[in-house]
């Protein structure tokens, strides 16, 4: 006869491990008992369980409640056992020693490999600001056994670097993603992808990039100066900018206080019916936590009568 087992049994942390040991005997041969022991190098054999044809299953106190025989029906030549709820400390070498009649004793060894799936964590780097050089966007760490693979999935252009730390029964892998921040990256996803044989599918953690910036400010509303004449209603100036975080707007007049009746509504400055008093230099001040910008325009409110008079003069002068 001969023993049938596996060289390696692989199980995920917390699952049950079946340790196979089957005696393929000639007809008439019987298995008296099967002794299972842990036999890691440098240490004596530690009893796991004894399956006896008459006495039944004896489980070592160290494994009480964790070792069982596979459910019926059972073949009397099958000395396999189930190790419940495998933990990392169970990883190692195991031996089954089979006592048969009349052929004698046989033994076989197997290695139990306990996969410890990683629980990845993603840590964003320092605040990203436009104008910075190469900057850490995020780091992703995953610890498991064996060492997990950590990669990045993103449309953003950047560079990655990885390092690994080996522990007694596992390895931690950290990958960093560096980039040169630009406003076009704002809102873009940066996904850490962790692969491991103990995972049914890759684990993904997504971080949304936030790049602080503030665009140049400009003022709209003076495109047609002829519209800015005395008596005109609904005249307004709008300050244009964009930023992250979204900026706030403030309006001032360079050559004095804002005239009465002028309404400030965020990025918009609304005028009452225009008078010459509204002529002046207006400043839009745009700011966020990252920066501030100014844009100024000169408003010249025209008097139509003056203009037409001047026009006549010009005509007569010609």
């Amino acid at each position: 006869g001969e023993l049938e087992t596996s060289d390696v049994v692989t199980v995920v942390l917390g699952q049950d491990a079946k340790l196979p040991c089957f005696y393929r005997g000639d007809s008439g041969e019987q298995v008296g008992q099967v002794a299972w022991a842990r036999v890691d190098a440098g240490e004596g054999a530690q009893e796991l369980a004894l399956l006896h044809s008459k006495y039944g299953l004896h489980v070592s106190p160290a494994y009480e409640g964790r070792v069982e025989q596979p459910p019926p029906p059972r073949n009397p030549l099958d000395g396999s056992v189930l190790l419940r709820n495998a933990v990392q400390a169970d990883e190692g070498e195991y031996e089954c020693r089979v006592s048969t009649f009349p052929a004698g004793s046989f033994q076989a060894r197997l290695r139990l490999r306990v996969l410890v799936p990683p629980l990845p964590s993603l840590n964003p780097g320092p605040a990203l600001e436009e104008g910075q050089g190469l900057t850490l966007a995020a780091s992703c760490t995953a610890e498991g056994s064996p060492a997990p693979s950590v990669t990045w999935d993103t449309e953003v252009k950047g560079t990655t670097s990885s390092r690994s730390f080996k522990h007694s029964r596992s390895a931690a892998v950290t990958s960093e993603f560096h980039l040169v921040p630009s406003r076009s990256m704002n809102g873009q996803p940066l996904t850490c992808v962790v692969s491991h044989p103990g995972l049914l599918q890759d684990q993904r953690i997504t971080h949304i990039l936030h790049v602080s910036f503030l665009a140049e400010a400009s003022v709209r509303g003076l495109e047609d100066q002829n519209l800015w004449h005395i008596g005109r209603e609904g005249a307004m100036l709008k300050c244009l900018s964009e930023g992250q975080p979204p900026p706030s707007y403030n309006w001032t007049r360079l050559d004095g206080p804002l005239p009465s009746g002028v309404r400030v509504d965020g990025d918009t400055l609304g005028f009452p019916p225009l008078t010459t008093e509204h002529s002046g230099i207006y400043v839009c001040h745009v700011s966020n936590e990252f920066s501030s910008r100014d844009s100024q325009v000169t408003v010249d409110v025209l008097d139509p009568q003056e203009d037409s008079g001047k026009q006549v003069d010009l005509v007569s002068a010609s």
Epitope: Q33, A35, A37, A45, E47, L50, H52, K54, Y55, G56, L57, H58, S60, P61, R97
Partner: antibody, heavy 123, light 107 residues
């Protein structure tokens, strides 16, 4: 024929010592685990100690730990129990018995017993 | 330690009676259970090992059953020489422990 014959019992004062012997014959003595089991007058059976075939890992009942020592001499086919600091509650018939080692520290039932030797601890 | 609880502690029966003695372990012991017979002034004698296996030379009127925690010794037809004290013993763990015994007396 398997035979186990105990000797060495007798009357001893509290605090005294006694050494019991068990002579074995009719089987491969060195291939079996050997135990001492005692029975106080009118009481039930109480396991005392066991020694493995290879003379390693002697085991003791809590009630005798530190006072009794089990040993064997496979060349003489003899099992011993050295009893020190004896107490009145150690008064009993002491039996030796054999059991087959299955594996590790797991044994069969004791299939053969000696006739016993009486130890009386009294002042 | 594993406690072995035997019942009854004594019983009276007549020759030819069917006698049943039970033994309960405080935790599972698979079939690591033996039954012994002891007569006054004599050493215990192994009757049943592995809960249900008859020791060589023991009459077939003795039988054992059970596994785990609950075990039974049955004497199918009591004979005069069967009047004795019967003990169960577990040897699943160290220390091995005995039941308190069941004395079978003549009615």
């Amino acid at each position: 024929e398997v035979q186990l014959v105990e000797s060495g019992g007798g009357l001893v004062q509290p605090g005294g010592s006694l050494r019991l012997s068990c002579a074995a014959s009719g089987f491969n003595f060195g291939g079996y685990g050997m135990s001492w089991v005692r029975q106080a007058p009118g009481k039930g059976l109480e396991w005392v100690s066991r020694i493995s075939p290879g003379d390693s890992t002697p085991r003791y009942a809590d009630s005798v730990k530190g006072r009794f020592t089990i040993s064997r001499d496979n060349s003489k086919n003899t099992l011993y129990l050295q009893m020190n600091s004896l107490r009145a509650e150690d008064t009993a018939v002491y039996y030796c018995a054999r059991a087959e080692l299955l594996a590790f520290d797991v044994y069969t039932a004791s299939d053969y017993w000696g006739q016993g030797t009486l130890v009386t601890v009294s002042s | 330690d594993i406690q072995m609880t035997q019942s009854p502690s004594s019983l009276s029966a007549s020759v030819g009676d069917r006698v049943t003695i039970t033994c309960r372990a405080s935790q599972g012991i698979s079939s690591y259970l033996a039954w012994y017979q002891q007569k006054p002034g004599k050493a215990p004698k192994l009757l049943i090992y592995a809960a249900s296996s008859l020791q060589s030379g023991v009459p077939s009127r003795f039988s054992g059953s059970g596994s785990g925690t609950d075990f039974t010794l049955t004497i199918s037809s009591l004979q005069p020489e069967d009047f004795a004290t019967y003990y169960c013993q577990q040897h699943y763990t160290t220390p091995p422990t005995f039941g308190q015994g069941t004395k079978v007396e003549i009615k």
